[in-house]
């Protein structure tokens, strides 16, 4: 019996087609992805093959103005239109709190939404009961397939799930649910979830009875043969893990942003064991036409976005200096504003020991592309912010050793004075440079804001300590020459859309007046 699994993950609000790098589509003939194009390909496969499942491994939420405006209603509407069979909850599905998940998505989705390792407690337990499930048994042709869901147990540190959801260890939570499916005579089981490739592989190895793992969160690109675009494969598709009982378990992921549609064919024997698996992600490029009816629907929903981008988010009573003459040479107040917004967006998980789980921000000055003049009545709009942050990136959470941070700050000024983009703006950090010293030895003082304290204060950076830092995904991926960050990071979790972070902060503050205050000397 053969099953075709079509899968997406980490779509992050890319409802419209995008450029090759998943930013705003400029030249339509070279654009990719989007739900209209995805629908064309899915329908083509559904017509050609008998047993097809369309699955999503989480993080549909967060990433473009679509999510900012529609807050998840767009996800439910277009996933329903594409007739997804199941979705696993990702960490970003909690970005607007539990209510922001329940109302727009859980109550509106016509497909099951899954996670076996999220347990509700207190008053939320009855409110959310039945709106998401640990597993679902789906009829496919004349067989049944069990889908078990899972979500990153780090979600409380990455999003806003509140205090009434407990995120258990994925493997511990999945095993009893798989065992339950076995007792129900469901012998073909897919684990669908959002915890990253390393955890996906562990699930494949350790959870007895799981036949296939469809993952997300790490934006992993797997491919067999010559890759069709710029993404470099992390391994073959499917990635085969040998389970502890000696089975071959295929593990798949389909990069991110709706650029690819994962396509996996599995052959099962009569006992539901995997005999063989093969496939590849399908690049959703312009050779695949956009479905006209879905496209028309997209255009209808688009109208509200254009209106939104000119509305006032808040006011500034000072000039927001985002000029390259400032931000690439010295502390600039636009850099301070953005870093403050980045930290504010990550205020969560305080306890009696920690005032917050992260206190530091770094931001390449070259990523700040425009100032905002306060003389336009002080008004700040989404459009203004899109000029400051035009690249459609995310502000991510990483864990780094102090020694890596020190290298990053040396790199920040290794060729100071040439108006290069690597000069770092900061938050929760005080850095002193001596530019008379030779490159690689210019950082003379580096103090960082404590997190394990009730009154935040600045302490000298410790080389062997592990620190959490918020930074643009561009830096996490080694951009502007920050190879040491990419090579030495100990953990990397993707965060929220950059403009969204700053716009939310401005809306919250209502009036802003960031200063230059001696963070960088």
């Amino acid at each position: 019996w053969e099953l075709t699994i079509l899968h997406t993950n980490d779509v992050h609000s890319r409802l419209e087609q995008t450029s090759e790098d998943s930013s705003k589509c400029v030249n339509a003939s070279r654009c990719m992805g989007g739900v209209a194009r995805l629908f064309t390909k899915v329908q083509q496969i559904r017509r050609a093959e008998p047993n097809v499942l369309l699955l999503d491994a989480g993080d549909q939420y967060q990433g473009t103005i679509w999510f900012t405006v529609y807050k998840g209603a767009e996800v439910a509407h277009f996933m329903n239109a594409l007739r997804y069979d199941a979705m696993a909850l990702g960490n970003h599905e909690f970005d607007n709190g539990v209510e922001g998940l329940i109302e727009p998505l859980l109550k509106e989705a016509k497909f099951p939404i899954l996670s076996a390792n999220i347990k509700a407690k207190g008053p939320l337990a009855s409110q959310i009961s039945g709106l998401y499930l640990p597993y679902k048994v789906l009829p496919v042709g004349d067989e049944v397939v069990g889908i078990v869901g899972y979500t990153s147990k780090e979600t409380p540190f990455l999003s806003n799930p509140g205090t009434n959801l407990v995120f258990e260890d994925e493997i511990t939570a999945l095993q009893p649910e798989v065992d339950k499916l076995k007792t129900l005579n469901v012998n073909k089981i897919i684990a669908l979830g959002h915890s990253g490739f390393e955890t996906d592989k562990l699930i494949a190895q350790k959870v007895r009875g799981v036949d296939v793992v469809v993952g997300g969160h790490s934006n992993t690109f797997l491919y067999t043969g010559n890759p069709p675009s710029k993404e470099v494969p992390a391994g073959k598709y499917p990635f085969i893990v040998t389970s502890d009982d000696g089975r071959k378990v295929p593990v798949v992921q389909a990069y991110a942003f709706g650029k690819y549609l994962g396509y996996l064919k599995i052959e099962f024997d009569e006992r539901g064991n995997v005999i063989s698996s093969h496939g590849n992600p399908i690049l959703l490029n312009s050779s695949i036409p956009e479905d006209p009816s879905i496209k028309a629907d997209i255009n209808k929903w688009r109208i509200k976005l254009d209106n939104y981008s000119t509305q006032e988010l808040g006011k500034t009573i000072v000039y927001l200096d985002g000029s390259s003459q400032s931000c690439r040479f010295r502390e600039c107040n636009m850099g301070n504003l953005i870093c403050d917004a980045m930290i504010n967006n990550n205020l969560r998980h305080a306890d009696e020991m920690f005032w917050n789980h992260v206190s530091m921000c770094i931001l390449n000055g070259g990523g700040i592309r425009s100032p905002i003049d306060e003389r336009n009545n002080g008004t700040i709009t989404w459009e203004n912010l899109a000029a400051v942050l035009p690249f459609g990136g995310t502000f991510d959470l990483v864990q780094l050793k102090g020694s890596t941070l020190k290298k990053a700050f040396e790199h920040s000024v290794h060729r100071y004075g040439q108006s290069t983009g690597e000069f770092l703006q900061v938050g929760g950090i005080h850095v002193v440079y001596d530019l008379s010293r030779k490159p690689g030895d210019r950082v003379v003082k580096l103090d960082v804001l404590c997190t394990k304290c009730r009154v935040p204060s600045y302490d000298p950076l410790k080389m062997d300590e592990i620190y959490k830092v918020i930074l643009p995904n561009f830096l996490a991926n080694g951009g502007d020459g920050f190879q040491m960050i990419k090579d030495e990071l100990l953990r990397h979790d993707s965060g929220d859309q950059d403009i969204n972070v700053v716009s939310t902060y401005i809306s919250k503050m209502k009036v802003i007046y960031p200063a230059v205050e001696g963070r960088i000397k």
Partner: antibody
Framework: QIQLQQSGAELARPGASVNLSCKAS????????MQWLKQRPGQGLEWIGA????????RYTQKFKGKATLTADKSSSTAYMQLSSLASEDSAVYYC?????WGQGTLVTVSA | DIQMTQSPSSLSASLGERVSLTCRAS??????LNWLQQEPDGTFKRLIY???TLDSGVPKRFSGSRSGSDYSLTISSLESEDFVDYYC?????????FGGGTKLEIK
């Protein structure tokens, strides 16, 4: 219950080939790696290679490439290992094994 | 290939004694390690899989653990039938590899 039944002892001349079999029962033959191992008298174990009967995928230790050839017949749930160009150092007990179950071993003696 | 260095190669111990055998992996193998027991007649039996999980029917005196790249099999109180050969096997990546074995002898 799961069983792996190996073929009987083989006596072979140097330069000849032998074909060892391992008949599996009690589990889904196509869905588990079948391993083959070598143990010379009084010595440790050497991992020769493995076959995944479902898709015929084979993996070998470098040392046994060209020496051992692994195949599987799904219809009879039997795995085979052919050893070629036999020499005295190929005299050993050969085991087929799942991760949790082992065959009883086949003694191969190479002698002129 | 991943090398598995097993120690000691032989060990003399008394009934009721607690003993530990160790395998060191030359590369990261995660938890992908089995411990096998070989009887004098050549019969093999898996005792532990995935570093620390006991196979069904294996007495509780056997346990497995890991510290960094060192993997241990511990027998808490030796019984007469335990004086046989033991091997570790890594299955993290192909080709799978065995430790050199430990011969456990009665003192």
């Amino acid at each position: 219950q799961i069983q792996l039944q190996q073929s009987g002892a083989e006596l072979a001349r140097p330069g000849a080939s032998v074909n060892l079999s391992c008949k599996a029962s009690g589990y889904s033959f196509t869905s588990y790696w079948m391993q083959w191992l070598k143990q010379r008298p009084g010595q440790g174990l050497e991992w020769i290679g493995a076959i995944y009967p479902g898709d015929g995928d084979t993996r070998y230790t470098q040392k046994f490439k060209g020496k051992a050839t692994l195949t599987a017949d799904k219809s009879s749930s039997t795995a085979y290992m052919q050893l070629s160009s036999l020499a005295s150092e190929d005299s050993a007990v050969y085991y087929c094994a799942l991760f949790s179950y082992w065959g009883q071993g086949t003694l191969v003696t190479v002698s002129a | 290939d991943i090398q598995m260095t097993q120690s000691p190669s032989s060990l003399s111990a008394s009934l009721g004694e607690r003993v530990s055998l160790t395998c060191r992996a030359s590369q990261d193998i995660g938890s992908s390690l089995n411990w096998l027991q070989q009887e004098p007649d050549g019969t093999f039996k898996r005792l532990i899989y995935a570093t620390s999980t006991l196979d069904s029917g294996v007495p509780k005196r056997f346990s497995g653990s890991r510290s960094g790249s060192d993997y241990s099999l511990t027998i808490s109180s030796l019984e007469s039938e335990d004086f046989v050969d033991y091997y570790c096997l890594q299955y993290a990546s192909f080709p799978y590899t065995f430790g050199g074995g430990t011969k456990l002898e009665i003192k």
